[in-house]
């Protein structure tokens, strides 16, 4: 039978390549049984994770899983870094793996796009 503990399904060592100026939604997949836990986002600064208090967040509910979303509108160059979501559940703190955002500043983007950029943004080949 399925565990009724809260589980946060951010993949270990996951990464996202994003462009400054674009909107972006960072998802924290959350599994819970009865009551939706209180979830927060933080940004890693060395070994400490600084809570993101004043950022826009929202929930997206799907059939078997929910997503706690951190909104970047737009992405800024200093959004580069590693993020983690945490859930408070029955006075336990559950922490996700961290996920890393690699922000490319359009103004300083190198002339040669990466393989990932070419796959997700074929128009980069023709700029």
């Amino acid at each position: 039978k399925e565990s009724c503990d809260v589980q946060l399904y951010i993949k270990r060592q996951s990464e996202h390549s994003i462009l400054a100026g674009d909107p972006f939604e960072l998802e924290c997949p959350v599994k819970y049984c009865a009551n939706r836990p209180h979830v927060t986002w933080c940004k890693l600064n060395g070994t400490t994770c600084v809570k993101l208090e004043d950022r826009q967040t929202s929930w997206k509910e799907e059939k078997n899983i929910s997503f706690f979303i951190l909104h970047f509108e737009p992405v800024l160059p200093n959004d580069n870094g590693s993020y983690r979501c945490s859930a408070n559940f029955q006075s336990n703190l559950i922490e996700s793996h961290s996920t890393t955002l690699y922000v490319t500043d359009v103004k300083s983007a190198s002339e040669r796009p990466s393989k990932d950029e070419m796959a997700s943004r074929p128009w980069l080949l023709y700029r």
Epitope: K11, R12, E15, H16, H97, K115, D116, A119
Partner: antibody, heavy 121, light 112 residues
């Protein structure tokens, strides 16, 4: 049941390219990582790279960066490995492997049966 | 790259006797989440590799308890308490924390 079904053996000419496929069943590749590994005849295992099919983000061993391109199609639950400018050094068996799984222990747990690539003129 | 050094290269063991394989990494495999990402797999002749042990000591489902994994940091060991005929093949350790992922050179277990 979790399975990774790889495409059939390939015999290719030097200088050509080849694209291998790895179709998953029993799980959604979007939820996990897919890795590709190389094993030359009677040799050890070499890690080529991995893809996060949820966002297409890849990581490669630098020595395969210009040789290999890993992609994924979540609609068909399939990952691909394209090898370019083939030489005899690329003659090997290539394995796709899942990393992730239901308990998220992050150790490659399910392996495809391997695809043999022979480069010969 | 993290170098994974496996010894011995070949292990010739009588059925029923114990066997031990060492794996040393050039960097610590302890991650910030407190887990150590050292894994062992077995490749039987003519087959794909199969996961045997993950996170140093956790046995994959279906793996008999005569196998044990131990170690920490950079020094790890796989032990088989009583070797059986089905244990023949090549054993690899590999690390799952640093990129690129790297493997030991393999230890071939054969029956004496």
């Amino acid at each position: 049941e979790v399975q990774l079904q790889q495409s059939g053996a390939e015999l290719v000419r030097p200088g050509a390219s080849v694209k291998l496929s790895c179709t998953a069943s029993g799980f959604n590749i979007r939820d996990d990582y897919v890795h590709w590994l190389k094993q030359r005849p009677d040799q050890g295992l070499e890690w080529i790279g991995r893809i996060d099919p949820a966002n297409g983000k890849t990581k490669y061993d630098p020595k395969f960066q210009d040789k290999a391109t890993i992609t994924a199609d979540t609609s068909s639950n399939t990952a691909y490995l394209q090898l370019s400018s083939l030489t005899s050094e690329d003659t090997a068996v290539y394995f796709c492997v899942r990393e992730g799984g239901s308990n998220y222990d992050y150790a490659m747990d399910y392996w495809g049966q391997g695809t043999s690539v022979t480069v010969s003129s | 790259d993290v170098v994974m050094t496996q010894t011995p290269l070949t292990l010739s063991v009588t059925i029923g006797q114990p066997a031990s394989i060492s794996c040393k990494s050039s960097l610590s495999l302890l991650d910030s989440d407190g887990k150590t990402y050292l894994n062992w797999l077995l490749q039987r002749p003519g087959q794909s590799p199969k996961r045997l042990i993950y996170l140093v000591s956790k046995l994959d489902s279906g793996v008999p308890d005569r196998f044990t994994g131990s170690g920490s940091g950079t020094d790890f060991t796989l032990k088989i308490s009583r070797v059986e005929a089905e244990d023949v093949g090549v054993y690899y350790c590999w690390q799952g924390i640093h990129f690129p992922r790297t493997f030991g050179g393999g230890t071939k277990l054969e029956i004496k």
